[in-house]
Each structure stands twice: as structure tokens, then as C-alpha cells.
């Protein structure tokens, strides 16, 4: 019996920047019950505040909701692993909530054959950022990645969209069934999942453009 | 303990390309973003680029782009920078930085000298 | 890019004397969300930078109190209220507002 292992604060996620959740790794536990709590302060203080909310993030977790979130100050946090035997800390973390967003996957993805008489035909792909990110005040530029395959293929083609919402592709091979999808990163932050997958149908008489 | 071992000393020709590797421990490799920051002798210092190796997502200063790519591989938990056709101004130590969850560098490499003479 | 300009070059100081270091930016280091990223870093001789200061103002983990960072839009300075022997080296300031995140010069700190 022994006491526990250090713990390590691996992942912070924000959605968009009004809430956040930390997760930890358990060191050993000595094998003992081992109790962890989460304590934080935030840049320019010195009082430090227990994890507002260990349930929603799930275990090992630490949930900030919208009244103890700030985009101003850097949050200095560490966790405290106790059992019968003794603690351990984890090293000190500092989060900006601004370098964490992870948003949610764009919206109402729609994609179209367009077949115009005087060039060549092409897929058009359109999508909307997602709903919780407000794009109107400037905190956030979002980019887009659009992945495509055929059905059958194991490969996926990739573009980079940039911080358009739409997107133009000219070489697909006629008579085939595509999936599309759509993932959106904020400039500093991370990768959202990919939406989920919209099909179309590549007519036999479409033009493959090289 | 957060550790950032690079790899030792070169020297390249002029024309020629070197990859200087940055060996994290001590934190799990894919929750931080590693930057590259170069150091003439006696000057100033000069932030080249940046990766997130948890999907090696990278962001470069446009001074070095077409020049410069970082690289990183999870299974080692190694950040590499490659830079192609070196010249003489290249001369410099070479630092890879961690970040937290935050854009300065708390973390540093110890630093590579890659001397660039014919 | 932002240009960084540091002053001066370098400081000769008496032990135990303050020390001033000013950082001057070409564009505001305030970002569209608020926040300031300035930073502050020393190099000691034969070492890697060390963060000292984040933020324009927050001492960084294990960074003694004489140190402090003021200053805000385009104006910075780093102050060291009585300069110790272990001080010496060049220090840095950082901007990581705008990409390219861009330092300062340097400014060599000896002791008299």
C-alpha cells in the first residue's frame, strides 16, 4: 500500500468559449481508494476555488459552466490525489480559454450536381458554422476541411476550404455515389468532429475535369 | 518532469537541408502544441513555426513557408523541423518550445547549433 | 509582422539596485478577445529562454516577486526591483497577439 501516483491534467475543451471541462489521468493508486480534487485560481489572484462541477464531463473531470468562465484570465490549475498513505499533485496547468475551442461539427451540409451549359459541370458543397459559435464579434475565425469519397473507396480526398462556407469540386468520377462531410477548427483551437456524411449521386454524363 | 531533448549539433552545406528533432517526456506529447524558434549567433530570436501533434496541424511564419516543415510523430512523442536550402544566414540554434493551453512557451529545448558553411 | 523594439541595448546595474527594461510594439498587442499577450523571457548565459512574465503582468510559476511587467496597448516595461547576481543574461520581450508571434531584440543585463 502505497500513496498514489501523480496525476496529469492531459485535456481542457471549450465549445465556444463560455464553458470548459478539464479531464485528468489517475496516477497509480496504490492500491487504496484514492479521492482527486481539482483546485484552480486564476491569473492575478491568489485565492484558490475547488472544481465547480466534477459530474458533468464525466469521470476525472472538471466542468467550468458559463459563471466561472473568462476568456480574460489564464486559469492555473492542478490536481490532489489522497488515499490513507499520503497525496500527490499533478503538475500545474495554465489554460486560456480562447487556445482550447473544440466547436461542434458545421451544420446543414447540402451538396449539388450543378451542370452549367458553358463550363464544366462540378460538385457544389455548402455548409453553416455551428450554432453556438458567434462569429459576429470577431473572437473567432473558423476554417473548414471538406473530406469526399466514393461509397466504396477506402480513401478519403481532402480539401481545405479556408473560411469559406462554400466549395467548388470539378474532378469526380461520373456514376458514382459520394459521401461528403465537413469539419471546422477556430485558427488556435482544435478540429471538430466530422459532420455527418451527406451522399449524392455523380451522374453517368458528368465531365471529369484533371 | 516536462523534458524537451533535441538532437546534437550539425553542419550542412550550403543548398543542403537539415531535420533537428525534439524528444518530449514527462506530459502526454499530444495535448500541447511544439514551436520552433531559431537564435543567430548573438541576435535576437526568430519564431518559425508551430505544430499540434495531436493531428499534426501545423501553422508557419511566411518568412520560412516552402522552406520549412514540421513534422511529429506520436509514437516517439518527437517533434522534427526541417529546413531545405540552407544558406549561411540559417546559421543558428535551432529550440523547439511547448506551450499549455496557451500561446507563450513555458518549455524549452535545450537548443541545436546548425552551422551552414561550404 | 510586428516589430518588437527593445530599450536599451544593454543595463549595467549595482547589486541590489532596480532595473528597467522598456518593450515598444509597432501595432497593438491588444487581441480581438481582450486579452494582451505580452511576454517576457530571460536567456542566461549558456541556457534556453525561461518564461518570466505571460500576460503583460502575471509572474510565471517559481518566478521571484521582484519581477513584475506593466503596460498595455503598444508600451510595455519589465521592472526588476532589486537586481541579484542570478539576473544576469538577456532578456526578451514577446508579442504572440498577431502571427507571426515576433521578440524583441534583447536586452543584456550585467552586473556592475
Known amino acids: 500500500q502505497l500513496p498514489p501516483g501523480k496525476p496529469e491534467i492531459f485535456k481542457c475543451r471549450s465549445p465556444n468559449k463560455e464553458t470548459f471541462t478539464c479531464w485528468w489521468r489517475p496516477g497509480t493508486d496504490g492500491g487504496l481508494p484514492t479521492n482527486y480534487s481539482l483546485t484552480y485560481h486564476r491569473e492575478g489572484e491568489t485565492l484558490m476555488h475547488e472544481c465547480p462541477d466534477y459530474i458533468t464531463g464525466g469521470p476525472n473531470s472538471c466542468h467550468f459552466g458559463k459563471q466561472y468562465t473568462s476568456m480574460w484570465r489564464t486559469y492555473i490549475m492542478m490536481v490532489n490525489a489522497t488515499n490513507q498513505m499520503g497525496s500527490s499533485f499533478s503538475d500545474e496547468l495554465y489554460v486560456d480559454v480562447t487556445y482550447i475551442v473544440q466547436p461542434d461539427p458545421p451544420l446543414e451540409l447540402a451538396v449539388e450536381v450543378k451542370q452549367p451549359e458553358d463550363r464544366k459541370p462540378y460538385l457544389w458543397i455548402k455548409w453553416s458554422p455551428p450554432t453556438l459559435i458567434d462569429l459576429k464579434t470577431g473572437w473567432f475565425t473558423l476554417l473548414y476541411e471538406i473530406r469526399l469519397k466514393p461509397e466504396k473507396a477506402a480513401e478519403w480526398e481532402i480539401h481545405f476550404a479556408g473560411q469559406q462556407t462554400e466549395f467548388k469540386i470539378l474532378s469526380l468520377h461520373p456514376g458514382q455515389k459520394y459521401l461528403v462531410q465537413v469539419r471546422c477548427k477556430p485558427d488556435h483551437g482544435y478540429w471538430s468532429a466530422w459532420s455527418p456524411a451527406t451522399f449524392i449521386q455523380i451522374p453517368s454524363d458528368f465531365t471529369m475535369n484533371d | 518532469e516536462v523534458q524537451l531533448v533535441q538532437s546534437g549539433a550539425e553542419v550542412k552545406k550550403p543548398g543542403s537541408s537539415v531535420k533537428v528533432s525534439c524528444k518530449a517526456s514527462g506530459y502526454t506529447f499530444t495535448s500541447y502544441w511544439i514551436h520552433w524558434v531559431r537564435q543567430a549567433p548573438g541576435q535576437g530570436l526568430e519564431w518559425m513555426g508551430e505544430?499540434?501533434?495531436?493531428?499534426?496541424?501545423?501553422n508557419y511564419n511566411q518568412k520560412f513557408k516552402g522552406r520549412v516543415t514540421i513534422t511529429a510523430d506520436k509514437s516517439t512523442s518527437t517533434a522534427y523541423m526541417e529546413l531545405s536550402s540552407l544558406r549561411s544566414e540559417d546559421t543558428a540554434v535551432y529550440y523547439c518550445?511547448?506551450?499549455?493551453?496557451?500561446?507563450?512557451?513555458?518549455?524549452w529545448g535545450q537548443g541545436t547549433l546548425v552551422t551552414v558553411s561550404s | 509582422d510586428v516589430v518588437m523594439t527593445q530599450t536599451p541595448l544593454s543595463l549595467s546595474v549595482t547589486p541590489g539596485q532596480p532595473a528597467s527594461i522598456s518593450c515598444r510594439s509597432s501595432q497593438s498587442l491588444v487581441h480581438s478577445n481582450g486579452n494582451t499577450y505580452l511576454h517576457w523571457y530571460l536567456q542566461k548565459p549558456g541556457q534556453s529562454p525561461q518564461l518570466l512574465i505571460y500576460?503583460?503582468?502575471n509572474r510565471f510559476s517559481g518566478v521571484p516577486d521582484r519581477f513584475s511587467g506593466s503596460g498595455s496597448g503598444t508600451d510595455f516595461t519589465l521592472k526588476i526591483s532589486r537586481v541579484e547576481a542570478e539576473d544576469v543574461g538577456v532578456y526578451f520581450c514577446s508579442q504572440s497577439t498577431h502571427v507571426p508571434f515576433t521578440f524583441g531584440g534583447g536586452t543584456k543585463v550585467e552586473i556592475k
Open positions: 500576460k503583460v503582468s
Open positions: 505544430i499540434d501533434p495531436s493531428d499534426s496541424y501545423t
Open positions: 518550445a511547448r506551450s499549455f493551453f496557451t500561446n507563450w512557451f513555458a518549455y
